[in-house]
């Protein structure tokens, strides 16, 4: 009685919301027919950013069908925090949860799915739906991976050298330059799980007037640039 | 392979109830939800409500509500639909649908009974 | 309760020529990102088939010349290309909290 294998569609909310919401459910035409009696463990990665709302979705089984609904919660040096609704007494029970944002859509009874009001880092981690039927489990995994945008900087720190950063990111941007130069890129580790890029490069061809930093990151692509003039210029700054 | 066997064509009279079965076999029998739906000569499908043998759970369509009554008989892994004060207009072919877990679709029927109401 | 309203009521298609037919629900049968939408096949003397589920899945053993689409409260299934023993009534029907079918939609092949 397991979840056929399956292939998933995230969904974004219009831009013009005041917090933007994502949810991570079926893209329908991609479930497989194998309806395997092998209990099977179906795991997503799912990227987030930072500071939307997250709904998480269980396999897609009527109510009348299950026993009980369990959403386990991991999350990176917490006790495993674990949701439950038991159909036959109409009650909810929480072990371990202490984070106040995440919380049920609404009454399981009604509805099963998971919502993560404002994603902070801290809700890097494992979410697991396990509905239990009177004939087996069916599991839906999450590997949410919280993403923070970062902070791009370019400016020109002396004759011909400019330096582009990108500060605070999750994961860590990648920096690549227009035209390539004689570059040097440092990474710094911050303990919340950013990470600041720093890219300086240097032109010795004279011919080169203008430069180009563009950052790569999940959460958007950013491009900077900037005129090498002989002496330090103007500082360049943005967000992605 | 899952099979569901239903019982023979009844024909009753006016007022009378009918007592319809539906054998299961080939899987666990109280695992899985049993619908009855029933269709009238030319009509479309409707469904009159299903019962859940592993807890005796049961939710009838409004339409059928006091005249219905849907059982299970876990030794013979059968489940019963009965509909009582029959008129002609209950004349119809009844089945019985197994729901499966993944997207609660039916993917096993009954091959249909069918109940003739006459005087 | 939800409604669903099947368009056309019957329809005629030569053999090799595409069918299409609608489902329209009364409100939205789109839960958690499933559609909770089904499409069976019924033949004469024969109860009904399961050939799509959850909207577009097509159900084990069932050819792929049938499709489905849609969601939220418009659904569509597509049988192309039409073969001769395609002639059957077909129903939607929504299954997720109480449970309805369309009105059911006749084929004929010409």
């Known amino acids: 009685a397991a979840q056929p294998n399956n292939s998933l569609m995230l969904q974004t909310s219009k831009e013009n919301h005041a917090l933007a919401s994502s949810s991570l459910c079926m893209d329908e035409k991609q479930i497989t027919q194998n309806y395997s009696k092998v209990l099977a463990e179906v795991n997503t990665s799912w990227p987030v950013k930072m500071a939307t709302n997250a709904v998480l979705c269980c396999p897609p089984i009527a109510l009348r069908n299950l026993i009980i609904i369990t959403w386990e919660i991991i999350l990176r040096g917490q006790p495993s925090c674990t949701k439950a609704y038991k159909k036959e007494t109409n009650e909810t029970k929480e072990t371990n949860c202490t984070d106040e944002r995440i919380t049920w859509v609404s009454r399981p009874d009604q509805n099963s799915d998971l919502q993560i009001r404002t994603v902070a880092i801290t809700h890097d981690g494992y979410y697991r739906c396990i509905m239990v039927t009177p004939d087996g489990n069916f599991h839906r995994g999450y590997h949410l991976q919280v993403l923070v945008t970062p902070e791009v900087t370019l400016f020109q720190n002396r004759n011909r050298t400019a330096v582009c950063k990108a500060v605070a990111g999750k994961p860590a941007a990648h920096i690549s330059w227009i035209p390539e130069g004689d570059c040097a890129t440092k990474q710094e580790y911050w303990s919340n799980g950013t990470v600041t890029v720093k890219s300086t490069c240097h032109w010795e061809v004279h011919n080169v007037s203008t430069v180009t930093c563009h950052v790569s990151h999940l959460t958007g692509n950013k491009s900077l640039y900037i005129e090498l003039l002989p002496v330090p210029g103007a500082k360049k700054s943005a967000k992605l | 392979q899952v099979q569901l066997v239903q019982s023979g064509a009844e024909v009753k009279k006016p007022g009378a109830s009918v007592k319809v079965s539906c054998k299961a076999s080939?899987?666990?029998?109280?695992?899985?939800?049993m619908h009855w739906v029933r269709q009238a000569p030319g009509q479309g499908l409707e469904w009159m409500g299903y019962?859940?043998?592993?807890?005796?759970?049961?939710n009838y369509n409004e339409k059928f509500k006091g005249r219905v009554t849907m059982t299970r008989d876990t030794s013979t892994s059968t489940v019963y639909m009965e509909l009582s004060s029959l008129r002609s207009e209950d004349t119809a072919v009844y089945y019985c649908?197994?729901?499966?877990?993944?997207?609660?679709?039916?993917?096993?029927w009954g091959q249909g009974t069918l109940v003739t109401v006459s005087s | 309760d939800i409604v669903l309203t099947q368009s056309p009521a019957s329809l005629a298609v030569s053999p090799g020529q595409r069918a299409t037919i609608t489902c329209r629900a009364s409100k939205s049968v789109s839960t958690s990102g499933y559609s909770y939408m089904h499409w069976y096949q019924q033949k004469p003397g024969q109860p009904p088939k399961l050939l799509i589920y959850?909207?577009?899945n097509l159900e084990s053993g069932v050819p792929a010349r049938f499709s489905g689409s849609g969601s939220g409260t418009d659904f569509t299934l597509t049988i192309n290309p039409v073969e001769a023993n395609d002639t059957a009534n077909y129903y939607c029907q929504h299954s997720h909290e109480l449970l309805t079918f369309g009105q059911g939609t006749k084929v004929e092949i010409k």
């Open positions: 019962i859940n043998p592993y807890n005796d759970d049961t």
């Open positions: 080939g899987y666990t029998f109280t695992s899985y939800v």
């Open positions: 959850l909207a577009s």
């Open positions: 649908a197994r729901e499966d877990y993944y997207g609660s679709r039916w993917g096993t």
